[in-house]
């Protein structure tokens, strides 16, 4: 028999610092967690003790904090290097800065593989990204080869700016022809590896003949056996098994997410590649592993940088920007629509010639808008200013729901009007009219949404039955403020951007803003 | 665009030297394990040299060991075969491999190679 350890991250999304337990920014360094300097620590660690091990990374390396904003994918280069990875599939968020934006400071500075098996150029794109991704990854372990494929979620066209010259076929379809292709060059140990949410992860165990582990990420999935360390509840148990279609026992794993763990499983092959066994947990990467001196050392000279960044206009606004809790809570406030336009800017795809856009609705939580923004400043928006409105360190998520769902997350909106509670939403492409004169749960007397599928947008009624993709906060995908019906009953939730970058990013590209409160939100009383 | 490709093949006497060349574009070469494999008439292709990709760590098939000495300059993005004592037997296609992998230790496996050249025929006659 031959024991692989495979150590394992994904949706790490920036954190190259240490963080606090929510992945958030990092107050209490006793109590801080994760961080690529105490990962290396860890990873070191496991290196020296076992002779077998791969370190491997599910996708979606980039967005998510200040670091990304800045540096643009070249510290995710830099430290990826530094801790050694050996292989990388291509998450979604790599393209969040279109094609140019993975290929320059990613594709080309990694000493690491970076896998898709699914993605095809086409057009002139084909011969310039050629080679600089691959399908497959033949890595000699040992005295044995491991083959890595990876895949990349075919939603990514929705979700982030990959061009019209990459084709993203179906992951199954696409890894079958690479995984026989492996078993014809003798290698018997593959490894899926790949960005495409835990649903598919077992789809390609169950239906991939010839993948004996799946490694995955995208939905943050945390699976544990035992008590669990922290606060993620587990999805299942780890390594979860799946059987594969032609009766094998196929463990497939994903680490949660931000660096907060560090995936180990160790598989035991026999003489053929077959696995016999495979066990592990996810490692809670906490304070009591120190961070590495030297990547501690690294890390700081790269902050510099940002520190500088944090204070350096993004644009200017010739409005005050009221993001006060009196109003947010209370009655749509022009921060919440400025907020909403540039969550629809962000996910603005071209990609069906029927549709205008694919999304058009936004909504948001006035409990989340925590500051104003004075014009009196000369106008100047920076983003520390932005990190003051939105300082939870968030993402702004697309999730698909039922017109039905969106009904009943209105009227929580206003169950407890008057209370100054966080739950108020504001939104963008829709019109709502409450009555509060009426009984909670039965508030909402006009609910219209902009249309999608039209060449000129215009506002129609909310049909109860009808799906509808949305763009909210990962704090109201996740059941937050009451909104458990948003939780329950959600059809599809794709994790989006860091909240202060689509922000920033949008008051940068229009460079002068001045939203008005413009009628989104109305009240009234009496017949309809 | 990854592209590797040899040059520098050629008609030699037996005993005689040559020097093949190797470029590769499209990411810095600094990025690659880079290996030389042959592959003769009829025969399997076969694993000649390898270098890592500091240039610090190399590696030799037993049968052109002490003759062939394979080098790197990654400011040029070029890899290098020099061949002395040249035998009969070295005549072959040589090829020029790059294996894009976050280690040191280059591998004389040709499965691990990622990106190959088109090749140069290199005959030595007696």
């Known amino acids: 028999a031959w024991e692989l350890t495979i150590l394992h991250t994904n949706d790490v999304h920036s954190r190259l610092e240490q963080t606090s337990e929510d992945s958030s920014k990092c107050v209490n360094a006793s109590r801080c967690m994760g961080g690529v300097a105490r990962l290396f620590t860890k990873v070191q660690q496991i290196r020296r003790a076992e002779p077998n091990v791969l370190l491997l990374d599910a996708g979606d390396q980039y967005q998510g904090t200040i670091w990304f904003t800045v540096y643009k994918g070249a510290e995710v280069a830099h430290f990826m290097n530094a801790l050694r990875y050996d292989a990388m599939a291509l998450g979604n968020h790599e393209f969040d800065n279109g094609v140019e934006g993975l290929i320059e400071p990613l594709l080309k500075e990694a000493k690491f593989p970076i896998l898709s098996a699914n993605i095809k150029a086409k057009g002139p794109l084909a011969s310039q990204i050629s080679g600089l991704y691959l399908p497959y990854k033949v890595l000699p372990v040992g005295d044995e080869v491991v083959g890595i494929v990876g895949y990349t979620s075919k939603e990514t066209p929705f979700l982030s700016n990959p061009g019209t010259n990459l084709v993203f076929e179906d992951e199954i379809t696409a890894l079958q022809p690479e995984v026989d292709k492996l078993k014809t060059l003798n290698v018997n140990k593959i490894i899926a590896l790949g960005h495409s949410g835990f649903e598919m992860d077992k789809l390609i165990a169950q239906k991939v003949r010839g993948v004996d582990v799946v490694v995955g990420g995208h939905s943050n999935t945390f699976l544990y056996t035992g008590n669990p360390p922290s606060k993620e509840v587990p999805a299942g148990k780890y390594p979860f098994i799946v059987t594969s279609d032609d009766g094998r026992k196929v463990p497939v794993v994903q680490a949660y997410a931000f660096g907060k763990y560090l995936g180990y499983l160790k598989i035991e092959f026999d003489e053929r590649g077959n696995v016999i066994s495979s066990h592990g947990n996810p490692i809670l990467l906490n304070s009591s592993i120190p961070e590495d001196p030297s990547i501690k050392a690294d890390i700081n000279k790269w902050r510099i940088k940002l520190d500088n960044y944090s204070t350096q206009e993004l644009g200017k606004t010739i409005v005050y920007l009221d993001g006060s809790s009196q109003s947010c809570r209370f009655r749509e406030c022009n921060m919440g629509n400025l907020i909403c336009d540039a969550m629809i800017n962000n996910n603005l795809r071209h990609t069906d010639e029927m549709f205008w856009n694919h999304v058009s609705m936004c909504i948001l939580n006035g409990g989340g808008i925590r500051s104003p923004i004075d014009e009196r400043n000369n106008g100047t928006i920076t983003w520390e200013n932005l990190a003051a409105v939105l300082p939870f360190g968030g993402t702004f998520d697309l999730v698909q729901l039922k017109g039905s769902t969106l009904k009943k997350a209105f009227e929580h909106s206003v169950h407890r009007y008057g209370q100054s509670t966080g739950e108020f939403l504001q939104v963008g492409g829709i019109h709502v009219v409450y009555d509060l004169s009426r009984k909670p749960g039965d508030r909402v007397v006009k609910l219209d949404v902009l249309c999608t599928k039209c060449r000129v947008p215009s506002y129609d009624p909310l049909k109860m039955d009808e799906v509808y993709k949305v763009i909210l906060p990962n704090f109201l995908a996740n059941g937050g403020d009451g909104f458990q019906m948003i939780k329950d009953e959600l059809l599809r939730h794709d994790s989006g951007d860091q909240d202060i970058n689509v922000v920033s990013t949008y008051i940068s590209k229009m460079k002068v803003i001045y939203p008005a409160v413009e009628g989104r939100i109305k009240f009234s009383t009496g017949s309809h | 665009q990854v592209q590797v490709q040899e040059s520098g093949g050629g008609l030699v006497q037996a005993g005689d030297s040559l020097r093949l060349s190797c470029a590769a574009s499209?990411?810095?070469?600094?990025?690659?394990?880079m290996g030389w494999f042959r592959q003769a008439p009829g025969k399997e292709r076969e694993f000649v040299a390898a270098i890592s990709r500091s240039g610090g760590v190399t590696y030799y098939a037993d049968s052109v060991k002490g003759r062939l000495t394979i080098s790197r300059d990654n400011a040029k993005s070029a890899v290098y075969l020099q061949m002395n004592s040249l035998k009969p037997e070295d005549t072959a296609v040589y090829y020029c491999a790059a294996d894009w992998r976050n280690s040191d230790s280059p591998s004389p496996l040709i499965i691990v190679y990622d990106y190959w050249g088109q090749g140069t025929q290199v005959t030595v006659s007696s």
């Open positions: 499209g990411r810095s070469i600094s990025r690659y394990n």
